[in-house]
Interface confidence: low
């Protein structure tokens, strides 16, 4: 579901989840008591939203959406939520939530949950924090301003005519001279790339004419010719000055190395916090909501609403229901246990040093740690064919009745020339196994050591059916490795 | 593939090597999607327009060591896609047999997009550049990126048809490379990896700003089984 | 690709006034400048006005006060306006564009494009 994070008109139908006054204090949860015992809770309020400790307005204050503080000097405050941009928009029109639904030319939207006339990847239910609502001009990419897939199938998309907000625009997020998470809220001076060419001059159209201008990306204060991320990318980065190379990611040092930001990330737990740690989880946990946020390996998770090191999609905003608070271990996917992503850019993610509870009353189980070995079972293990079984290399070495087998490469007690690891190099013929080198129908066979008898089938129990092996899923889980 | 890892033994097992019946040299991958047909690259089957010239193993983790689950099928048809897309079909001469180690990946539903940013996974014996693997099976995490993104100047520049995706790391140092070609790009769909790509070119391997482009296999699954029907 | 077609020429006395139209079609994806250009027998092509998306102008000194160039964003069309036409006004004019076209998907792939012509004769 799509939750709006601005407001209409003085904001009491705003169900978004600013939690923080506009002073910076944090809000206290509208069901406390302390420090400030409430008039409106939701007990007194159940409709007005009062969930959790987020900025409401349940008796219609003209000043817009506020809370209770959790600093005992400050009753309440107000918080500063943007205005919906419904009928104009700020900046690029990232938020934009208006419904203009025609492009510059006149020509009407596709709807963005529709693939015709324009096939695309661009999936409202893959994207919810984007409000890909109806056929609605929307700017999920970081373009300059909102667009459209177009009904008409010789253009396949198209620029919207929004008018731009004349109001203030909303407060800026902090901002940054070291590089944090993808680096678009860095507003430093670094103005060369990583090859150590000059960065072009955002607002010059030479040696690189481009739409990354100042005019089309008015809050990515692209000044002079300092790296900027103003659409998304992995990285600040910049046009060069070199007529060959059109543009270059830039060398920010990160602030996790630098204590320099201008302001410091509230919503990154400080480190200080020792949380009450849930000590187990039921079942596959995804019910745990414990405080835990460590591996198996020792290493910190990285929070849940970062993107940093590692991008992924593992958001609250795609998962509101999974608890993906902080940097806590929780399992969103129905995987085997609670995991997260690792703070190590080099380890992607890791189940969590957590146990399962007991559900028995019994003793602790241990969730199985990550292995990089296979998960299906072992060649030796595998212990039954398939078909005729002449893939069969199991060690069964005993004929269905019972007798042991002669070895492959022995003579005694019957001479035999057919069948030996000379002449069957790819059979399998190793020591005395039961086995199947000329795909006879009645399955795996060996020379006996019974004088009496040449040959017998030995009894091999049939895998699970091939039937049984469905498209897409293979035995052994895979790595799942991360790119580098 | 460049990056990445060596895969767990087995993990991929749709995964083939197409390789010349005479030499068995590996030149490209390819994917089980049903127990007698292959799907691979157009462009990895200019060697010889006859089918005698290729063979298939299967259940292969080792390029070059034979191991015990391995199978090995020559080819009785090659279907090239009529529209000179770079996709074509192997029939093999007889059915692969299904096993825990070569198992079919599944198709697509026809004309589905995958979404902007979904991960997807491309596996292969191809040119690693270096980054250690090599010989052995790799796997590398890629996001795909929507057409209308990877089309822009700063990456592909207008080369990207609607019949094929984009995946790839903007910042390059993980891709698919030569030898990979024909291989898959497979995503995870609820409990099921389905075939979205099929490898087929890039500009240089897993430099920045150029994702490696797959051919979009939900354009052509209506294609694909009508051969498999009349095959 | 991109193609340019100009309208509005033909003979004129001089003193009166003439509106020469350019419009731009193809996959357009955005144009930056639109710029009108002459040439005469036997001179150099000249720039004699450009409009910047953003509706910036800059003329030509010997065109200066007399003409105006104008551009409908949305319909892909630059125009200039010729008052107080003079015999030496008289060549062929010609349209130029820059900016990014479209293809199979949304691309920035560059494109400058000119324009076939239209003559503007200025009789005395």
């Known amino acids: 579901v799509y939750l709006s994070e601005c407001k209409t008109g003085i904001g009491n139908g705003y169900r978004g989840t600013m939690s923080r006054t506009k002073s910076g204090v944090a809000c206290q949860k509208w069901g406390a008591t302390f420090p400030h015992v409430p008039n409106y809770s939701p007990s007194t309020h159940p409709n007005e939203g009062l969930e959790e400790n987020y900025c409401r307005n349940p008796d219609n204050d003209e000043q817009g959406p506020w809370c209770y503080t959790t600093d005992p000097d400050k009753r309440y405050d107000y918080c500063n939520i943007p205005e919906c941009e419904e009928e104009c928009m700020y900046c690029s029109g990232e938020k934009y939530e208006g419904k203009i639904s025609k492009t510059m030319s006149g020509l009407d939207c596709q709807a963005w949950d529709s693939q015709s006339p324009h096939a695309h990847g661009y999936i409202p239910a893959k994207f919810p924090s984007k409000n890909l609502k109806m056929n609605y001009c929307r700017n999920p990419d970081g373009e300059p301003r909102p667009w459209c897939f177009t009904t008409d199938p010789t253009k396949r998309w198209e620029y919207c005519d929004i008018p731009r907000c004349t109001t203030p625009p909303p407060p800026p997020s902090p901002t940054y001279q070291c590089l944090k998470g993808r680096g678009e809220n860095y507003r430093g001076t670094v103005s060369v790339t990583v090859s150590g060419k000059t960065c072009q001059r955002w607002s010059e159209q030479t040696p690189h004419r481009h739409n990354r201008t100042p005019e089309n990306f008015p809050c990515k204060n692209l000044e002079e010719n300092y790296c900027r991320n103003p659409d998304g990318e992995t990285a600040p980065w910049c046009y060069t000055t070199d007529s060959q190379l059109r543009w270059e990611y830039c060398e920010i040092p990160s602030c996790e190395s630098s204590a320099s930001p201008d302001q410091s990330d509230s919503s990154v737990p400080p480190e200080e916090q020792t949380p009450v740690v849930q000590e187990c989880y039921q079942s596959d946990g995804q019910s745990y909501r414990g405080t835990s946020s460590t591996t198996i390996t020792g290493k910190k998770c990285q929070s849940w609403a970062a993107m940093f090191p590692h991008r992924h999609s593992k958001t609250p905003e795609n998962f509101p229901d999974a608890g993906l608070e902080m940097n806590y271990c929780r399992n969103p996917d129905g995987d085997k246990g609670p995991w997260c992503y690792t703070t190590d850019p080099s380890v992607r993610w890791e189940y969590c040093n957590l146990k399962r509870c007991s559900e028995t009353g019994g003793s602790v189980v241990e969730l199985p740690t990550v292995s990089q070995e296979p998960s299906g079972p072992s060649d030796s293990e595998t212990d039954c064919m398939y078909g005729n079984g002449k893939d069969y290399r199991g060690k069964t070495a005993v004929t269905a009745a019972g007798t042991p087998c002669q070895g492959w490469a022995a003579q005694e007690p019957h001479r035999h020339s057919i069948f030996t690891p000379q002449t069957n190099p790819r059979a399998g013929l190793e020591k005395n196994y039961c086995r199947n080198p000329d795909g006879d129908v009645n399955g795996p066979w060996c020379y006996t050591t019974n004088p009496r008898k040449l040959y017998d089938y030995c009894d091999i129990p049939l895998c699970a059916s091939a039937s049984s092996f469905e498209c897409g899923k293979p035995q052994v889980e895979p790595k799942k490795c991360p790119g580098r | 593939v460049v990056g990445g890892c060596v895969a767990n033994p087995h993990s991929w097992p749709w995964q083939i090597s197409l390789r010349t019946r005479f030499t068995g040299q590996h030149f490209c991958g390819g994917t089980l999607i049903a127990p007698e047909w292959v799907l691979t690259a157009a462009h990895c089957l200019e060697k010889s327009s006859r089918p005698e010239f290729y063979k298939v193993i299967l259940g292969a983790h080792e390029e070059y060591i034979r191991g015990l689950d391995v199978q090995e099928i020559s080819v009785a048809k090659l279907i090239l896609e009529p529209n000179n897309r770079d996709i074509a079909l192997l029939k093999l001469s007889r059915p692969a047999t299904i096993t825990d180690k070569v198992i079919p990946a599944c198709l697509p539903s026809p004309n589905y997009m995958v979404a902007d940013r979904t991960i997807c996974y491309i596996t292969g014996w191809g040119e690693t550049q270096g980054t250690f693997g090599a010989g052995r099976l790799k796997e590398a995490q890629l996001p795909v990126i929507e057409n209308k993104v990877c089309n822009r100047v700063e990456y592909l520049n207008n080369r990207v048809k609607s019949t094929e995706l984009c995946a790839g790391q903007l910042a390059g140092g993980v891709d698919s490379c030569q030898g990979d070609s024909g291989g898959p790009l497979v995503c995870f769909e609820k409990d099921k990896y389905i075939l979205q790509g099929v490898t087929s070119w890039g500009l240089g391997c897993a430099r920045p700003n150029k994702p490696g482009v797959y051919v979009r296999v939900s354009r052509f699954v209506d294609w694909i089984e009508r051969e498999m029907r009349n095959n | 690709q991109v193609q340019l077609v100009e309208t509005g020429g033909g003979l004129v006395q001089a003193g009166g006034s003439l509106r020469l139209s350019c419009a731009a079609s193809?996959?357009?994806?955005?144009?930056?400048?639109m710029d009108w250009y002459r040439q005469a027998p036997g001179k150099e092509r000249e720039l004699v006005a450009a409009?910047?998306?953003?509706?910036?102008?800059n003329y030509a000194d010997s065109v200066k006060g007399r003409f105006t160039i104008s551009r409908d964003n949305a319909k892909d069309t630059v125009y200039l306006q010729m008052n107080s036409l003079k015999p030496e006004d008289a060549a062929f004019y010609y349209c130029?564009?820059?900016?990014?076209?479209?293809?199979?998907?949304?691309?920035?792939?560059?494109?400058?494009?000119w324009g076939q012509g239209t003559q503007v004769t200025v009789s005395s």
């Open positions: 130029n564009a820059d900016g990014y076209y479209s293809d199979y998907d949304k691309n920035l792939a560059e494109f400058n494009s």
């Open positions: 409009i910047t998306s953003g509706g910036t102008t």
């Open positions: 193809g996959n357009i994806f955005s144009i930056n400048a």
